[in-house]
């Protein structure tokens, strides 16, 4: 029996030197054999250990930063504004997500070795963090809109209502993340590493798309439109009225929203393209699939990075956060009281002036 090269580089090489005139039922190499080719994943040129290092850094920064943010807000009980309460919840969401990062990091190296329970819990925390984040930012935008555009000492000034809104946001976030809790499990396959993803039997692909489209619409696009509407009008009002003080006060909130969008919009746009491809709205080809997969890898890192960025924004832009932190340090004798700024007020993100509440 004739030997042949199992690692032949191409069909042409494979057939080279053959006496094709004796070929039993075709005298030429059929062209469609060239389409019997593999679609090989072109992994992103980021070493998986480099990704693990990023995850570790984000974990440490997020743990430290969000703990400090929560500490400062909780300490400043007297002048705590509505926005403070929303930002407190935002920090809590980021902190909860950060706690799952070591598990995600380990799964990048070894596949999903943690079983179905952790697969569900960790995935749920990731989803809840994302949805509560954008919903809280939408609420802040509505609060700023009412305070600045309509100059109302808004309904949300009533503490029980703010608490109710925050609880509703957590509830809605859980609802939007429910598909993950219900359908995610550890999937074991004989020839690939175990993975943590949605498994719905024979209809997995269709269900996965439906359960991705619904939360993407209600959990990302709708709050995004609310934010654009509210901040559009808020900015217009500020510029028209030359409200310099309030304009300065909006800097941190705008920075928070901008960073959120910079971190999560790319991932969601790529996810949308992926959804369109998997539902065959856009034709899926090997090249496109590889582009999408690499883009998902890269933009997911951006999204994960977001959980440690808000405290940095407060630290570098938010004057009152710095003051609040210094105050806590002074209270505990870690720094001299003399080093406190003269105008150091107890509130982390703002005070009320007249009918409006300025933030940061």
């Amino acid at each position: 029996m004739e030997d042949f090269n199992m690692e032949s580089d191409s069909f042409e090489d494979f057939w080279k030197g053959e006496d094709l005139s004796n070929y039993s039922y075709s005298s030429t190499l059929p062209p469609f054999l060239l389409d019997a080719a593999p679609c090989e994943p072109e992994s992103l040129e980021i070493n998986k250990y480099f990704v693990v290092i990023i995850y570790a850094l984000v974990f440490l920064l997020s743990l430290l930063g969000n703990s400090l943010v929560m500490l400062v807000i909780l300490y400043s009980r007297v002048g705590r504004s509505v926005t403070d309460v929303y930002l407190l919840n935002l920090a809590l969401a980021d902190l909860l997500f950060a706690l799952t990062l070591p598990i995600w990091a380990a799964s990048k190296v070894n596949g999903w070795i943690f079983g179905t329970f952790l697969c569900k819990v960790v995935s749920l925390l990731k989803e809840v963090n994302f949805y509560s984040g954008i919903l809280l930012l939408a609420c802040i935008s509505v609060d700023r809109y009412l305070a600045i555009v309509h100059a109302t000492r808004t309904l949300t000034q009533k503490r029980y209502l703010v608490k109710f809104i925050c609880l509703s946001i957590w509830g809605l976030s859980l609802l939007l993340a429910l598909p993950v809790l219900l359908f995610r499990r550890t999937v074991y396959s004989s020839n690939v590493s175990p993975a943590c993803y949605e498994d719905m039997g024979n209809n997995t692909a269709n269900w996965r798309m439906l359960l991705r489209i619904l939360p993407q619409s209600f959990g990302f696009i709708v709050p995004l439109l609310i934010m654009l509407f509210c901040y559009g009008f808020t900015l217009r009002t500020l510029f028209k009225a030359h409200m310099g003080q309030k304009h300065r006060a909006m800097r941190v909130i705008f920075a928070v929203v901008l960073i959120f969008l910079l971190c999560w919009l790319p991932y969601n746009l790529v996810l949308l393209a992926d959804t369109l491809m998997r539902t065959q709205v856009i034709q899926e080809t090997c090249e496109r699939r590889n582009h999408i997969d690499r883009a998902l890898d890269a933009t997911e890192i951006l999204g994960i990075l977001h959980s440690c960025l808000n405290p940095l924004i407060y630290a570098f832009i938010g004057q009152k956060f710095r003051h609040g932190l210094l105050k806590i340090l002074a209270i505990h004798g870690l720094i001299s009281k003399d080093s406190l700024p003269k105008d150091s007020r107890p509130s982390f993100v703002g005070s009320s002036s007249g009918h409006t509440s300025t933030t940061l």
């Epitope: 690692e7 032949s8 580089d9 191409s10 469609f32 389409d35 019997a36 080719a37 593999p38 679609c39 090989e40 994943p41 899926e284 080809t285 090997c286 699939r289 590889n290």
Partner: nanobody, 111 residues
Amino acid sequence: EVQLVESGGGLVQAGGSLSLSCAASGLIFRLSGMAWYRQAPGRQREWVAVLTKDGTLHYADPVKGRFTISRNNAENTWYLQMNSLKPEDTAIYYCNTGRYWGQGTQVTVSS
């Protein structure tokens, strides 16, 4: 790295059936094409059936109507269902995608 592992070969009586499997790893399975080849003792290797990237099926004349190529995306496995087997179908059957080859599985059809 792409790996292909065939199974399902064996000894069968003429007129009988066999199902060959080719488990693949290291590729985006649903977007990959593949081909089944065979090589009988003292003969040239020949393609038997092809499943292209876009899902089109092709069969060599001697096996048309008897062999069926299929795939299971959930299990990353290709299949070759061989019915009405003839002694001339005796060969080592290989699954192939691009430059990657399985180790082969022996099919022997006795008369």
